[in-house]
Interface confidence: medium
């Protein structure tokens, strides 16, 4: 062929048109082409209908083609693998009717911000779905209902703050779930169902250890050998499970599976028996696990600990309160986001050196109906206000930015930033030990502060508080069993792992298949 390389391997006729500055499909490709590489071209838009004459096409690579739109028309009846990674797609095309035989779909590293409910309708043969490195914040319930044969699902490196409770329902063949490097703070009760999940990657999320995490804690305890930290180039047979990689974000990287849950409701008169799947509250001390029953106490004062204030908040408040236009690396104090607590148990974590800090206490008096009043945004002290500008780009950094928290694993793709603040070139520096600023009483909504970073809003607004700490350092101390700590970290959102670094996604696809 005058433009592309054609090679025959066994029964496959492979046509390589990679990196040829193509803006459209080259004419006169062999009609019996089975594998077509169109990577690294300048296609911008592409219509699958142009491939209809190639009735034997089983694999199509359209990665790195500047695609902003993929037109789905016609039918490619035997196409099994479609690689759309590293493009500029902002929405997932509805592929079901066009690609009924699709088994592998890779849409990693695009600009997907949401998925419609029927996004996967018609993809009943799909076995592998890779959505890593997009800008997904939520997923529709029932998203995966049309794909009962799904075996591998990568949602790593997105901005997911929550997961639909029934997302995995009916996925009896699912053997690998990659959720690392998101903004997940809890797992809904019953999320994992009862079927075995041999490979789960859950690290690099800001897990909020409160009473709502107990279902997840119990799942981690029961599935400790199936929880891994992904390491590039390591065969799964050589991988060591690492349940300690799943860490509380609000408690100095304490492993979630060891979270004591003191003060949480349990089976019995005082507890909400439906709160966490009838898992009894357990006090983990060393190797002994002691089931306990505790009367729920609602404190009138918030305990201030070295890692900040402990509160839980409603999921609903996340969508309504979170600024949508902030890039993960920005700092903004235009509004201090607060969240109403559901209820606040009086609990203390069992850690080797736990002391209550002298940071200012928040005096929050609960009211009889804690969900009715709105939180009052409060400007953060000692921070320069950033004015947003219309430019859809990342901010120019300030000359001396406040230390940014870092996540132990690499960064996810950011939320879309239609407007991003451009900081002033010389912000007023925050004092290293700021004066205690009393947090005003708010009727029902205490401000949630974390000493190292900010408000506990997953990957959203930031304010620097008393002691900037490198989360990386605490991670290295907390997980000595890692052969080597992850080496690439991103500001606020880590993301060392490229799309190839997901198991099964690229290089080690071979190695994690059921052995």
């Amino acid at each position: 062929h005058p433009i592309c390389e054609v090679s025959k391997v066994a029964s496959h006729l492979e046509v390589n048109c990679d990196k040829r500055n193509l803006t459209a499909l080259p004419p006169d490709l062999p009609k019996d082409t089975t594998i077509l590489h169109l990577s690294e071209n300048l296609l911008y838009t592409f219509s699958l209908a142009t491939l209809m004459p190639y009735t034997r096409l089983t694999q199509l690579n359209l990665d790195r083609c500047e695609l902003t739109k993929l037109q789905v028309d016609g039918t490619l009846p035997v196409l099994g693998t479609l690689d759309l990674s590293h493009n500029q797609l902002q929405s997932l095309p509805l592929l079901g009717q066009t690609l009924p035989a699709l088994t592998v779909l890779d849409v990693s590293f695009n600009r997907l911000t949401s998925l419609p409910l029927g996004a996967l309708r018609g993809l009943g043969e799909l076995q592998e779905l890779y959505l890593k490195g997009n800008e997904l914040k939520t997923l529709p319930p029932g998203l995966l209902t049309p794909t009962p044969k799904l075996e591998k699902l990568s949602l790593a490196n997105n901005n997911l703050t929550e997961l639909p409770a029934g997302l995995l329902n009916g996925l009896e063949n699912l053997d690998t779930l990659l959720l690392q490097e998101n903004s997940l703070y809890t797992i809904p009760k019953g999320f994992f169902g009862s079927h075995l999940l041999p490979f789960a990657f859950l690290h690099g999320n800001p897990w909020l250890c409160n009473c709502e995490i107990l279902y997840f804690r119990r799942w981690l305890q029961d599935n400790a050998e199936n929880v891994y930290v992904w390491k590039q180039g390591v065969d799964v047979k050589a991988m060591t499970s690492n349940v300690a990689s799943v860490q509380c974000d609000n408690s100095d990287k304490f492993p979630v599976y060891k979270y004591p849950g003191k003060g949480c409701p349990t089976l019995g008169d005082e507890g909400d028996t439906d709160l966490y799947d009838y898992y009894p509250e357990e006090d983990t001390e060393g190797d002994k696990v002691r089931a306990t029953r505790t009367v729920v106490k609602f404190p009138t004062k918030a305990h201030t600990t070295p890692w900040g204030l402990f509160y839980s908040w409603s999921t609903a408040s996340l969508d309504s309160q979170m600024p949508s236009s902030l890039h993960p690396t920005q700092e903004s104090t235009k509004e201090q986001t607060t969240f109403p607590p559901r209820w606040t148990p009086n609990f203390t974590l069992h850690m080797e050196s736990i002391t209550f800090s002298k940071t200012p206490k928040s005096t929050t008096e609960p009211t009889p109906s804690p969900t009715t009043s709105e939180p009052v945004p409060e400007p953060a002290p000692n921070m320069t206000t950033l004015e947003p500008t219309p430019s859809p780009t990342t901010p120019e950094p300030t000359s001396e930015p406040a230390p940014s928290p870092t996540t132990p694993e690499p960064t996810s793709e950011p939320a879309p930033s239609p407007t991003t603040p451009e900081p002033t070139s010389e912000p007023a520096p925050s004092p290293t030990t700021p004066e205690p600023t009393p947090i005003p009483t708010i009727a029902t909504s205490p401000t949630i502060l974390v000493s190292a970073t900010s408000l506990i809003t997953p990957k959203s607004t930031f304010l620097t508080t008393t002691k900037p700490v490198s989360l990386l350092e605490s991670t290295k101390k907390t997980i000595p069993e890692l052969d080597q700590p992850p080496k690439l970290r991103g500001v606020l959102q880590g993301h060392l792992e490229s799309s190839r670094n997901d198991p099964f996604l690229h290089p080690d696809f071979c190695c994690l298949l059921p052995l």
Epitope: H86, Q232, G233, T394, E413
Partner: antibody
Amino acid sequence: QVQLVESGGGVVQPGRSLRLSCAASGFTFSSFAMSWVRQAPGKGLEWVASITSAGTPYYPDSVLGRFTISRDNSKNTLYLQMNSLRAEDTAVYYCARSRGYEDYFDYWGQGTLVTVSS
Amino acid sequence: DIVMTQSPLSLPVTPGEPASISCKSSQSLLNSRNQKNYLAWYLQKPGQSPQLLIYFTSTRESGVPDRFSGSGSGTDFTLKISRVEAEDVGVYYCQQHYSSPWTFGQGTKVEIK
């Protein structure tokens, strides 16, 4: 034709800050991942930071928390904010382009020298 | 991190003669999904910035003379110059773009004898 022009280098004392810029032209800047790679005097190449077309930053441990990469697509400009500079940060800093975050660097700027010295 | 090791570190060459540089990675760079090895070669001529020669182990960048060729797979890679010319002098670097952080070899200095 693709052009990358770095600026902002100079002599700075340890602990101080500096901001580098890279002006890009000749291609659709917003569609490409961009990186900074440095070369200490008489030494080899070391990757410093990358930012995807969507704006996600990446760093190695050596600069994490001190350096910030950003981009302004409206100005076709890449930035590297360097804080808490150390003597070992002394190098020529190159701006480089790649198709996707995971890809090789297909175009490089001419570099700008940063000297950290008291 | 993936460690890239080049040899030799210095290579005196005679114009018109072939030259070969080796690059070894501490782990495989083969992407089994697309059968590509994520290795690139760059040349930094004296006083200039690096320029891309070869990517994905063996694909020449446009404008690069065909006397340059790359080969190898997994962890062992080779850059060959079939007939060295005076303009080929400089430092050659291999780089893996398979796993972050991206890492380079220490460089091989090619100079005319």
